[in-house]
């Protein structure tokens, strides 16, 4: 059974994941982002089901494509580069989903834009956090 300290750690990791996903989304949605139209042409795979931590496997598998789309931003000055954000997200996802069990991700038939993709995983984090608090 999960201890209160392990639950607290999981909650904190989910909160950090949520914050960085929201940061990426905010940067994309910035009305001054000239690359938004191009970014929206890229399609992402959505999970058929995302209700448990093991389903983060579906997010992990889309991190590389996410980084490639974020690289389109090509800002002359990054405080954080896309690879910094994706690297941190990857570390958190690996810790949260664990490596003990191998889970084969099932994807929905319909693909999604980067905005829809990020919103889906933001909702996932918020949902899991709400069950822990």
């Amino acid at each position: 059974a999960p201890t209160s300290s392990s639950t607290k750690k999981t909650q904190l990791q989910l909160e950090h994941l949520l914050l960085d996903l929201q940061m990426i989304l905010n940067g994309i949605n910035n009305y001054k982002n000239p690359k938004l139209t191009r970014m929206l042409t890229f399609k992402f795979y959505m999970p058929k089901k995302a209700t448990e931590l093991k389903h983060l496997q579906c997010l992990e598998e889309e991190l590389k494509p996410l980084e490639e789309v974020l690289n389109l931003a090509q800002s002359k000055n990054f405080h954080l580069r896309p690879r910094d954000l994706i690297s941190n997200i990857n570390v958190i996802v690996l810790e949260l989903k664990g490596s003990e069990t191998t889970f084969m991700c099932e994807y929905a038939d319909e693909t999604a834009t980067i905005v829809e993709f990020l919103n889906r995983w933001i909702t996932f984090c918020q949902s899991i956090i709400s069950t822990l608090t």
């Epitope: 909160e15 950090h16 994941l17 949520l18 914050l19 960085d20 996903l21 929201q22 940061m23 990426i24 905010n26 940067g27 910035n30 001054k32 931003a73 800002s75 002359k76 000055n77 990054f78 405080h79 954080l80 580069r81 896309p82 910094d84 954000l85 690297s87 941190n88 997200i89 958190i92």
Partner: nanobody, 119 residues
Framework: EVQLVESGGGLVQPGGSLRLSCAAS????????MGWYRQAPGKGRELVAA???????NYADSVKGRFTISRDNAKNTVYLQMNSLKPEDTAVYYC?????????????WGQGTQVTVSS
């Protein structure tokens, strides 16, 4: 409006350590990037290190392995632990607060704190 208050600068010998702190107050959002930039005499402002509220970090190549950035989200404070300081680290260090991972005109900057590395 966001206010940034820096502290911890000073004079230190080569090989020594300093810890900079920067507290943000005002219109703070939970989703942000805080960090440190520096400007040496006669040079442009350059990134030292930055950290998101989610824990993503970016370091200048010149400080990797020597400097560590961290933050306390509850206190809206960012820290820069500087070890193995070198004379070339001498500069004015500016705290930065941003709402996005890339620089734009809505970023806020502190007044700066002087770091001098000299024997």
């Amino acid at each position: 409006e966001v206010q940034l208050v820096e502290s911890g600068g000073g004079l230190v010998q080569p090989g020594g350590s300093l810890r900079l702190s920067c507290a943000a107050s005002g219109s703070i959002f939970s989703i942000n990037v805080m960090g440190w930039y520096r400007q040496a005499p006669g040079k442009g402002r350059e990134l030292v290190a930055a950290i998101s509220s989610g824990g993503s970090t970016n370091y200048a190549d010149s400080v990797k392995g020597r400097f560590t950035i961290s933050r306390d989200n509850a206190k809206n404070t960012v820290y820069l632990q500087m070890n193995s300081l070198k004379p070339e680290d001498t500069a004015v260090y500016y705290c930065m607060y941003a709402s996005s991972w890339y620089e734009d005109e809505t970023d806020y900057w502190g007044q700066g704190t002087q770091v001098t590395v000299s024997s």
